[in-house]
Interface confidence: low
């Protein structure tokens, strides 16, 4: 929304770097085949590039990732009660980022 | 994806809190009358609620928040020509987060 | 007033190394962007390198990209260019210069450029 | 990688006459083409941005023009302080590029 400009900082622009988002861990990812569990933890934190480049022909892309493997519980129910097992969920986290130039595929003539 | 158990750390939940997030500064900000002009920057940071609660009938939610107006820079393209005018978006923060219960509707009966 | 003060040229061998620095005065030195261009003797400019107003974000040309690390630290008001593996070819008087303007890739100010000479 | 070519690479001219430069990108660069001004020992200084803007404190004389691929630096009537080379550079993308420049000698 539009203000005043006297008490307006100059924006910042969000540069293309790596930031702490948040990972929802879907079922799917541990079991596909059972829908009849839970996963805990539900989210994680990982390390994500975003923000903005110069110009609208480039975009903040990852150069460099790492994935990195985290222990979760798989909580299924059997007959209404808990059993808790071990599952492996791998995470990418991004390491650097770079403002990279979008190809845009030609039209096939 | 799956991965072997042996180096996998135990994950940790992203707990409801602030986290750094980009913004996008989409032009319908500044003038709704006028698609002929740039915004610079084109995305700022701000803080938001993000992470997860410990079951699934309560939300990471914001409890307290802050605008926050900054000052852009608006490019009208005039006659092929850039002419630079400044204008204030403001920007919601959010300072403080809780995990609330997800009040759902009551059927209509 | 503007002012960009480069330093920490000098005659070095082929194989060697340099750093350079850029003090910066006048402006709010961590809010823009900033660059290395170079100029061989008696030839036309060419740019080196370019990194954000936070230096997250940095860009090479080919001909360095490898040997050559933009930095900045905003405490200092200080760019800086770390040259590794020095060629002939880089020879070349190298200024600093500030981006501000309606792209972060031109250059409003320029300093006045140290000489980096390599030779055996 | 973009390259950016200029003409004439070299020209003469006396006080008061009207100079062309042009500028030609290999290819699109929108609005995205600077022009600089470097006398010999000199600080390059920036003349015209944005293919057409001129920077602030620049004179009048000096003009720009252009869109796409094609480009255009103009002085309406040479001054004796004009004599110098002039480079066109796109910011469009990176690796960023300068044209070969253009000498302005006293005819």
């Known amino acids: 929304s539009l203000g005043s400009l006297a008490a307006a900082e100059p924006a910042v622009i969000a540069e293309c770097k790596t930031r702490t988002e948040v990972f929802q861990i879907s079922r799917n990812l541990i079991d596909r085949t059972n829908a009849n569990f839970l996963v805990w933890p539900p989210c994680v934190e990982v390390q994500r590039c975003s923000g903005c480049c110069n110009n609208r022909n480039v975009q903040c892309r990852a150069s460099q990732v790492q994935m990195r493997p985290v222990q979760v519980r798989k909580i299924e129910i059997v007959r209404k009660k808990p059993i808790f097992k071990k599952a492996t969920v791998t995470l990418e986290d991004h390491l650097a980022c770079k403002c990279e130039t979008i190809v845009t595929p030609r039209p096939v003539t | 994806s799956l991965g072997s158990l042996a180096a996998a750390e135990p994950a940790v939940i992203a707990e409801c809190k602030t986290r750094t997030e980009v913004f996008q500064i989409s032009r319908n900000l500044i003038d709704r009358t006028n698609a002929n002009f740039l915004v610079w920057p084109p995305c700022v940071e701000v803080q938001r609620c993000s992470g997860c609660c410990n079951n699934r009938n309560v939300q990471c939610r914001a409890s307290q928040v802050q605008m926050r107006p900054v000052q852009v820079r608006k490019i009208e393209i005039v006659r092929k020509k850039p002419i630079f005018k400044k204008a204030t978006v403001t920007l919601e923060d959010h300072l403080a987060c809780k995990c609330e219960t997800i009040v759902t509707p009551r059927p209509v009966t | 007033e503007v002012q960009l003060v480069e330093s920490g040229g000098g005659l070095v061998q082929p194989g060697g190394s340099l750093r350079l620095s850029c003090a910066a005065s006048g402006f709010t030195f961590s809010s823009y962007w900033m660059s290395w261009v170079r100029q061989a003797p008696g030839k036309g400019l060419e740019w080196v390198s370019t990194i954000s107003d936070g230096g997250g974000t940095t860009s090479y040309a080919d001909s360095v990209k490898g040997r050559f690390t933009i930095s900045r630290d905003n405490s200092k008001n200080t760019l800086y260019l770390q040259m590794n593996s020095l060629r002939a070819e880089d020879t070349a008087v190298y200024s600093c210069?500030?981006?501000?303007?309606?792209?972060?890739?031109?250059?409003?100010?320029w300093g006045q450029g140290t000489l980096v000479t390599v030779s055996s | 990688d973009i390259q950016m070519t200029q003409s004439p690479s070299s020209l003469s001219a006396s006080v008061g006459d009207r100079v062309t430069i042009t500028c030609r990108a290999s290819?699109?660069?929108?609005?995205?083409l600077n022009w600089y001004q470097q006398k010999p020992g000199k600080a390059p200084k920036l003349l015209i941005y944005a293919a057409s803007s001129l920077q602030s404190g620049v004179p009048s004389r000096f003009s720009g023009s252009g869109s796409g691929t094609d480009f255009t630096l103009t002085i309406s009537s040479l001054q004796p302080e004009d004599f110098a080379t002039y480079y066109c550079?796109?910011?469009?993308?990176?690796?960023?590029?300068f044209g070969g420049g253009t000498k302005v000698e006293i005819k």
């Open positions: 550079q796109q910011s469009y993308i990176t690796p960023l590029t």
């Open positions: 290819q699109s660069i929108s609005s995205y």
């Open positions: 210069a500030e981006s501000g303007g309606a792209t972060d890739y031109l250059f409003d100010y």
